[in-house]
């Protein structure tokens, strides 16, 4: 037993029984201790969701996470998971995985909006993009939920002591 | 005063599974993440995984996934971790710790595990 | 996973001298202007006591005769004057990456 001590730079609600949080959702890239989405905190020593700090922070086990995110804002646009690539549905549309459905079967009834190649291949001149084929096969973003960020992690060490007393 | 308290020592048979306890107290239980750590006879420390009351948040060591699992429960202060398809590799200490600013600062007494036929 | 390496791996030294304990890391345990690298102390039959955090911090009633200094990638810590009472075991442990890892540690005897 133990405890912290002295700085030489200065200084909820009932659950039923019991609550169990599997080990699962682990990607294999290195090992990961934190499940996909979640980055490790080492002043909590937990795994906290990357939503909290993708538009303050870099944190390099969020990175393809925060990227995704903000594709996903941007609209008429989708993130491959396999690529690791923000793709515009505008240049997959007839080819296009259910993400951009939406946006790809609107366009369709709108050919004015369409791009030229598009446009050329609702008028029967079809464009060889062999290498879009088969690439996209919808694989769904599971978002986890967002847990409370940790304040205060840019401070210096005397400020963190405080913060995290 | 900050107290956790492990349960008594195990002595099990290979295959077979342990479910051991570390009951906390003297502080927010919410408030920090319990983590398990693995001391093999005369050897270094190994961490498995740690469990957050708060958050669900559990990271966990690979080497131990299918070998621990981690369960809380908040109305006594309590966590749990349960070993199965025991073998003798995984006779050792196992102690919880309390962690807090990136530090495991409370340790329990350890639990002892002996698996033997 | 971050790998320390401890040196000594044992250590005899007098009374009332000092003793230093060191320790490397494979990669920087630097996180937001502070180095996440703890030590422990441990005695036989008893668990791990936290004797200093982030590289250079007391632990709960651990005397001044401790100390620890470093940054990035190298650490050590200091005992002075030594003390019979400071015998044991004591083992590094970073915190920056998970998984936390620790040193194999030094076992610390007197002269």
């Known amino acids: 037993m133990s405890g912290l001590g002295r700085s030489r730079r200065g200084g909820r609600s009932r659950v039923d029984q019991e609550e169990r949080f599997p080990q699962g959702l682990w990607t294999g890239v290195a090992m990961r201790s934190c499940p996909e989405e979640q980055y490790w905190d080492p002043l909590l020593g937990t795994c906290m969701s990357c939503k909290t700090i993708c538009n303050h922070q870099s944190q390099r086990t969020c990175a393809a996470f925060c990227r995704s995110l903000s594709c996903r804002k941007e609209q008429g646009k989708f993130y491959d998971h396999l690529l690791r690539d923000c793709i515009s549905c505008a240049s997959i549309c007839g080819q296009h995985p259910k993400q951009c459905a939406y946006f790809c079967e609107n366009k369709l009834r709108s050919p004015v909006n369409l791009p030229p190649e598009l446009r050329r291949q609702r008028s029967g001149e079809v464009e060889n993009n062999s290498d879009n084929s088969g690439r996209y096969q919808g694989l769904e973003h599971r978002g986890s939920e967002a847990s409370p960020a940790l304040p205060g992690l840019k401070l210096s060490a005397d400020q963190v002591a405080l913060v995290y007393s | 005063e900050v107290q956790l308290q492990q349960s008594g020592p195990e002595l099990v048979k290979p295959g077979a599974s342990v479910k051991i306890s570390c009951k906390t107290s003297?502080?927010?239980?919410?408030?920090?993440?319990i983590h398990w750590v693995k001391q093999s006879h005369g050897k270094s420390l190994e961490w498995i995984g740690g469990?957050?009351?708060?958050?669900?948040?559990?990271p966990f060591n690979q080497k131990f996934k299918g070998k621990a699992t981690l369960t809380v429960d908040k109305s006594s202060s309590t966590v749990y971790m349960e070993l199965r398809s025991l073998s003798s590799e995984d006779s050792a200490v196992y102690y919880c710790a309390k962690w807090v600013r990136g530090a495991m600062d409370f340790w329990g007494q350890g639990t002892s595990v002996t698996v033997s036929s | 996973d971050i790998v320390l390496t401890q040196s000594p791996a044992s250590l005899a030294v007098s009374l009332g001298q000092r003793a230093t304990i060191s320790c490397r890391a494979s990669e920087s345990v630097d996180y937001y202007g502070m180095s996440l690298m703890n030590w422990f102390q441990q005695k036989p039959g008893q668990p791990p006591k936290l004797v200093i955090y982030?590289?250079?911090n007391q632990g709960s009633g651990v005397p001044a005769r401790f100390s620890g200094s470093g940054s990035g990638t190298d650490f050590r810590l200091n005992i002075h004057p030594l003390e019979e009472d400071d015998t044991g075991m004591y083992f590094c442990q970073q915190s920056k990456e998970a998984p936390p890892t620790f040193g194999g540690g030094t076992k610390l005897e007197i002269k």
């Open positions: 982030a590289a250079s």
């Open positions: 469990i957050s009351p708060n958050n669900g948040g559990s």
């Open positions: 003297g502080y927010t239980f919410t408030e920090s993440t």
